[in-house]
Interface confidence: low
């Protein structure tokens, strides 16, 4: 059956999507609703004023908020049951043409797995371009480049995360299918371990190539919110982090990778549901910016600024805040304008510090997360093989040959 | 209860056209793709044409194409098959289904069936 | 286009007895198959979505199984309001096929 890529193209009624958890309390028009009540404790990313540096707290129940539906980074869009455009939304897979569509047969046999997917196209994610991921048997899609124990915390596209076991039964299967403008995950008849008389759960992930994300929701047996979530987090959303690498007291050459979530946008559980959707439209970052005027003229709800050395635009909190820190851009952006930058060489600067992408630990424990709300250790696996699923393996050397262990 | 409820079939001479028509309830019309199957007197089943549930997308089997045109109007609950330059072999009853486009692209509910004869 | 292949095209058996029904598909179709069930002047009736799926309200007695080319569609007690003709449908690529069909006869 014929591809489907253009599902979800048209634009639907607003979302009744409610996003809680992290922002970015800084730069973010959160609004207090008293009529709103969030969970208590949740997690909100802060900046610490006094050392500029950054740190997880929690916000006492009296200051809980509810964020709009834009979410600076994304717009969300629901579509319950009776709207037409949430059956548009799901991707048939069944139309792909085979050769797109891959039955991963380690994470349909498996539980707790994990397995990395070369994509056909960049997929920008919170306005970074990615080229690989990382499929979870728990029904979310790891968008982190670095594989480490606390897979479920951050870095996240999850449609529905939760203790799914598809190796329970044959008929559950972990599909993925790859057109070159969609690449889209669906969890087919996958039961949660433990609740499986609740029936099985069909529902995708689609991550259109414009950054567009869809989550399509076929077969919800039971009531979100009652699923467990005391071995494996039960999430919905999206959420995105940066690592620093630290020098470790330890040993003083290494360094210690610590994981800072960013932006995180958690949907209100109650509303997945059989046949509804949501639809993630990616809004303009400071990262689209090629041009020192266009960077610093631009109308974004992020404060963004231009580093001369890097020729990058960025509000500094993104993947690439380590070379921003190392290359001084912070300091180098105060006060000045475009015309400053005019004569100056931005080939010859170096970072204050060596950094190399896979410096440290690729193993990194939960220790050094500094992540202080996560209750639950998982013990997802990555399957670092290609075996029989012509699966490519991008895994640094450091990690092949044995499994990972992962974790929330 | 899903009910669907075929119409608009009758004796037609080679060359004519028909409208066939499919009343859906029971249902969120709307949210469902839907099919046309046929079948001739004492043959099997053969897919004819699907819909998606926006009508955005259709589809039809080599033997039915540039003749036959589905399509739906969701504020009516309807479905059709206006079908022209008919021929002989176009001859069956033909049921419309409610089809579950998603991974395994079944017909889960069947109308009853209206017969179209072509005939001279 | 995919072909499938029913056989046998016609089978008589005893109330009680388990039937098997096969179905072969051309080419691999992985577990994108479907069976109907259709009675005599009546509309067909899903009965097993994804090879083995049972839709609901099918009675436990139907099952179904394979993957890749080779098909069974059992009934493990026939009962007398089994007597229809029984069709599997591929749903692999378009257009979509079915089999021509399996009658069966209560003895």
């Known amino acids: 059956l014929s591809p489907q890529p253009g599902a979800g193209h048209d634009e639907g009624p607003g979302s009744g999507w409610a996003a809680k958890g992290t922002v970015r309390g800084w730069n973010r028009r959160a609004r207090e609703s008293p009529g709103h009540v969030s969970e208590p404790d949740r997690t909100q990313l802060s900046q610490d004023l006094g050392g500029g540096t950054l740190a997880m707290d929690t916000l006492p129940d009296n200051r809980t908020r509810v964020v709009e539906d834009n979410h600076s980074y994304y717009v969300s869009r629901l579509y319950g049951p009776s709207e037409p455009h949430s059956r548009e939304l799901w991707v048939d897979v069944a139309e792909a043409n085979r050769s797109q569509v891959k039955i991963h047969t380690i994470l349909s046999n498996t539980h707790r797995q994990a397995s990395r997917v070369v994509l056909s196209f960049d997929f920008p994610f919170y306005g970074h371009p990615l080229r690989q991921i990382t499929i979870a048997t728990g029904g979310f899609i790891f968008m982190g480049d670095v594989i480490h124990r606390m897979l479920t915390a951050t870095q996240y596209v999850a449609p529905l995360m939760a203790n799914f076991n598809p190796g329970y039964s044959d008929n559950s299967t972990v599909v993925y299918f790859d057109n070159g403008t969609v690449f889209v995950v669906q969890w087919d008849h996958v039961y949660l371990q433990g609740w499986e008389d609740k029936g099985s759960f069909t529902f995708q992930a689609a991550l259109h190539h414009d950054g567009r994300i869809v989550f399509a929701y076929k077969e919800i047996p039971m009531s979100v919110p009652e699923i467990s979530s005391s071995q494996h987090p039960v999430k919905t959303g999206l959420s995105d982090a940066f690592m620093i690498l630290n020098p470790s007291p330890d040993v003083p050459e290494s360094r210690r990778r610590s994981i800072f979530e960013y932006h995180r946008i958690e949907l209100d559980p109650s509303k997945v549901t059989s046949m509804s959707a949501v639809e993630f439209t990616p809004l303009p970052t400071c990262l689209q910016h090629r041009s020192c005027d266009a960077c610093m003229s631009s109308d974004l709800t992020f404060n963004c600024s231009w580093c001369h050395v890097l020729q990058r635009c960025s509000s500094g909190f993104d993947r690439y805040r380590q070379e921003w820190m190392d290359y001084g851009c912070a300091q180098e952006a105060e006060g000045r304008m475009c015309e400053d930058f005019q004569d100056e060489d931005h080939d010859s600067a170096s970072p204050d510090t060596s950094f190399s992408p896979y410096d440290g630990d690729l193993t990194t424990t939960s220790s050094s997360l500094f992540i202080d709300s996560l209750t639950t250790e998982d013990d997802t696996k990555l399957n670092p093989y290609a075996g029989g699923d012509g699966l490519q393996n991008n895994l640094s050397p450091k990690t092949k040959g044995t499994p990972v262990h992962l974790g929330t | 209860e899903v009910q669907l409820l075929e119409s608009g079939g009758g004796l037609v001479q080679p060359g004519g056209s028909l409208r066939l028509s499919c009343a859906a309830s029971g249902f969120t019309f709307s949210t469902y793709a839907m099919s046309w199957v046929r079948q001739a007197p004492g043959k099997g089943l053969e897919w004819v044409s699907s819909i998606y549930g926006s009508g955005g997308k259709t589809y039809y089997a080599d033997s039915v194409k540039g003749r036959f045109t589905i399509s739906r109007d969701n504020s009516k609950n309807t479905l059709y098959l206006q079908m022209n330059s008919l021929r002989a072999e176009d001859t069956a009853v033909y049921y419309c289904?409610?089809?579950?486009?998603?991974?395994?692209?079944?017909?889960?509910?069947w109308g009853q069936g209206t017969l179209v004869t072509v005939s001279s | 286009d995919i072909q499938m292949t029913q056989s046998p095209s016609s089978l008589s058996a005893s109330v009680g007895d388990r039937v098997t029904i096969t179905c072969r598909a051309s080419q691999s179709i992985s577990r994108y198959l479907n069976w109907y069930q259709q009675k005599p002047g009546k509309a067909p009736k899903l009965l097993i979505y994804a090879a083995s799926s049972l839709q609901s309200g099918v009675p436990s007695r139907f099952s179904g199984s394979g993957s890749g080319t080779d098909f069974t569609l059992t009934i493990s007690s026939l009962q007398p309001e089994d007597l229809a003709t029984y069709y599997c449908?591929?749903?692999?690529?378009?257009?979509?096929?079915f089999g021509q069909g399996t009658k069966v006869e209560i003895k």
């Open positions: 449908q591929q749903s692999y690529s378009y257009p979509v096929t």
């Open positions: 289904a409610r089809t579950d486009y998603s991974l395994y692209y079944q017909f889960d509910y």
